[in-house]
Interface confidence: medium
């Protein structure tokens, strides 16, 4: 990844901090649990333009919806090493493009206002977002070699404890927009036709918390609502995730305490913020917005299927590009017929509505959404159609 030197890690952090925007989205179903649903207002939609959705390493939606304490909209990415170099993105065709390291978006897109915790419940219709087992390299406390672009929520403390890998599957939005995690529909998996139904071999990562529960590994995405679907469980949860539909939990995380500390670190990691992290384009111009979908869908090794997305825990310094024994693939790639294939290449229509698929190192697949006069697309995979009228309203 070509790195552009930045003054310091702090500087880099600042640069990125202003680049992520949490879009608040409420899940109607959330009301059922008696929890306040965040308004429909898309605070970061003020930027009209192409939107990029990123499917990061495996972060699970699991506890993503578990936010009970107000979550501040500020978030920042953590990149490899102190310098936040440019991020190399590969277009679906294979052409590598370098995204500016400083993905800054207008402050307004930052949605810095504290949003009430929206604990959306996945209103899955047909797809299963259950937790999936992911194979992910386990790394000790120290930063792993490959640090997936993580979105860290600033809960008010000077040091952001909770980390949300760029996960966007669990957008707390109306049921119609909820993503069901069951992405690789074409894959065979045990017990379910196109569901990648088996757990990947090892823990994956899912940082979004559906409710107040612990997270689970992510799996692949499947089209749950309409024709769009997040990664399936294997990619959602670091472990054996049974949430292929991006199922979210209902528990109120309010009464949940973090053992030994009272900090919200774990809880927040579990929660899927009511807002979705958005990465602003390096130019910071409203015309180019990248939507980063946390690595909620960590593609883990799915025993019953031929596709494995993530390495298993226990390989802290393992490069995801290739896997040990050739069983693991780099983030954004899946093992297909014995070789690692780009999600973009494997699933030509991964990005809907004409969106262009890109692979970003250490993050995964991103969709750069189409923008037309008066109409543009948004969402992790450009699945939603937005009009200027809707944005203004």
């Amino acid at each position: 990844v070509p790195a552009r030197e930045t003054g310091s890690a702090i500087e880099a952090e600042e640069l990125v901090r202003s680049s992520l925007a949490w879009e608040s989205r409420a899940n109607d179903t959330r009301e059922e649990a008696g929890l306040p649903a965040a308004g429909e207002d898309e605070t970061s939609w003020t930027e009209r333009g192409s939107e990029m959705a990123a499917v990061g390493p495996g972060v699970g939606p699991e506890e993503a919806l578990e936010a009970s304490a107000a979550v501040t909209g500020t978030a920042w990415l953590e990149a490899d090493g102190p310098g936040l170099g440019g991020v190399t993105a590969e277009a679906g065709s294979g052409d590598a493009q370098t995204l500016p390291a400083t993905l800054q978006a207008p402050d307004e897109a930052l949605g810095s206002s504290t949003m009430p915790p929206a604990i959306p419940e996945a209103t899955e219709t047909s797809g299963p977002p259950s937790p999936a087992v992911h194979d992910k390299p386990s790394v000790g406390p120290e930063l792993p070699k490959e640090i997936p672009l993580e979105v860290r929520l600033n809960l008010g403390g000077s040091t952001p404890e909770p980390t949300f890998p760029l996960q966007g599957t669990l957008e707390t939005q109306p049921a119609s927009d909820i993503i069901d995690i069951d992405y690789f529909e074409g894959l065979d998996s045990e017990g379910r036709g196109a569901d990648m139904g088996s757990f990947p071999g090892s823990p994956g990562t899912s940082e979004n918390h559906p409710d107040t529960e612990g997270e689970t590994p992510s799996w692949s995405l499947l089209d749950l609502y309409d024709d769009f679907t997040p990664f399936d469980e294997s990619d959602f949860y670091p472990t054996t995730s049974f949430y292929d539909d991006l199922e979210e939990e209902e528990e109120e995380e309010e009464d949940k305490d973090t053992v030994g500390g009272g900090d919200l670190e774990d809880e927040n990691d579990l929660l899927l913020p009511s807002q979705k992290p958005g990465v602003g384009p390096g130019t910071g111009q409203p015309t180019n917005r990248w939507h980063a979908v946390p690595p909620q869908h960590t593609l883990g090794m799915v025993p019953g299927s031929s596709i494995s997305l993530r390495p298993r825990p226990g390989d802290p310094g393992k490069d995801l590009a290739s896997g040990e024994n050739g069983t693991e693939c780099r983030v954004g790639f899946v093992r297909h017929n014995g070789s690692c294939r780009s999600v973009c290449d494997l699933f030509p229509s991964y990005c809907h509505n004409g969106g262009q698929c890109y692979l970003v190192e250490n993050i995964g697949a991103f969709c750069r959404c189409n923008t037309q006069d008066y109409i543009w697309h948004k969402g992790m995979r450009c699945e939603s159609i937005i009009t200027d009228f809707q944005v203004m309203c």
């Epitope: 939606p61 299963p128 992910k136 990562t205 590994p217 054996t240 199922e247 053992v259």
Partner: antibody, heavy 118, light 113 residues
């Protein structure tokens, strides 16, 4: 209040079949993955199977793969476990459990005893 | 499969004293992407189903008394009951929730001395 109630257990001969049911209430059933966990008399816990909220994905322990089938009817808020080709070693109390996204089981039913004996 | 091994098999502690249960996994259950340890602890009292106490190695489930705490990372974990109460007499299980199949430790029986 979350409640899980298993039923369908009983005495069955080796090679026989049995279908367990788990009626769920108190939460949005279709939004959660569900699992079956069993516990042989005087023994520890063993995860048996799991199913995603939509029912699209299913998972099994090697010990029951090919013999047990997990399913769910979200319209009835019910989880099922069809057990075929039962063996003596399948004798246990079977619990259905609501599964958190991190795969931990936060709510368990009281369990139903399955005895496989000739 | 990840093998979970608990120690000791049984533990007798005086009321009000600290009880410590260890759990070791054959493979790391820590995920670098979210720095979470996919490990849970359960309490099972005689004739009852298990009850989730802690997940992610150290996060208490709602309603669980704060005398229960979990710690550890990677492959070594500990469940601590800071001040044992009579109602804490039970069998405690650790479970790795990181990979399929989900596996449990053999259990540790905690009794009053």
């Amino acid at each position: 209040e979350v409640q899980l109630l298993e039923s369908g257990g009983g005495l069955v001969q080796p090679g026989g079949s049995l279908r367990l049911s788990c009626a769920a209430s108190g939460f949005t059933f279709s939004s959660y993955a569900m699992s079956w966990v069993r516990q042989a008399p005087g023994k520890g816990l063993e995860w048996v199977s799991a199913i995603s909220g939509s029912g699209g994905s299913t998972y099994y322990a090697d010990s029951v793969k090919g013999r047990f089938t997990i399913s769910r009817d979200n319209s009835k808020n019910t989880l099922y476990l069809q057990m075929n080709s039962l063996r003596a070693e399948d004798t246990a109390v079977y619990y259905c459990a609501k599964t958190k996204p991190n795969n931990a089981f936060d709510y368990w039913g009281q369990g139903t005893l399955v005895t496989v004996s000739s | 499969d990840i093998v979970m091994t608990q120690s000791p098999d049984s533990l007798a502690v005086s009321l009000g004293e600290r009880a410590t249960i260890n759990c070791k996994s054959s493979q790391s259950v820590l995920y670098s992407s979210n720095n979470k340890n996919y490990l849970a602890w359960y309490q099972q009292k005689p004739g009852q189903p298990p009850k989730l106490l802690i997940y992610w190695a150290s996060t208490r489930e709602s309603g669980v008394p704060d005398r229960f705490s979990g710690s550890g990372s990677g492959t070594d974990f500990t469940l601590t009951i800071s001040s044992l109460q009579a109602e804490d007499v039970a069998v405690y299980y650790c479970q790795q929730t990181a990979t399929q199949p989900l596996t449990f430790g053999q259990g540790t029986k905690v009794e009053i001395k």
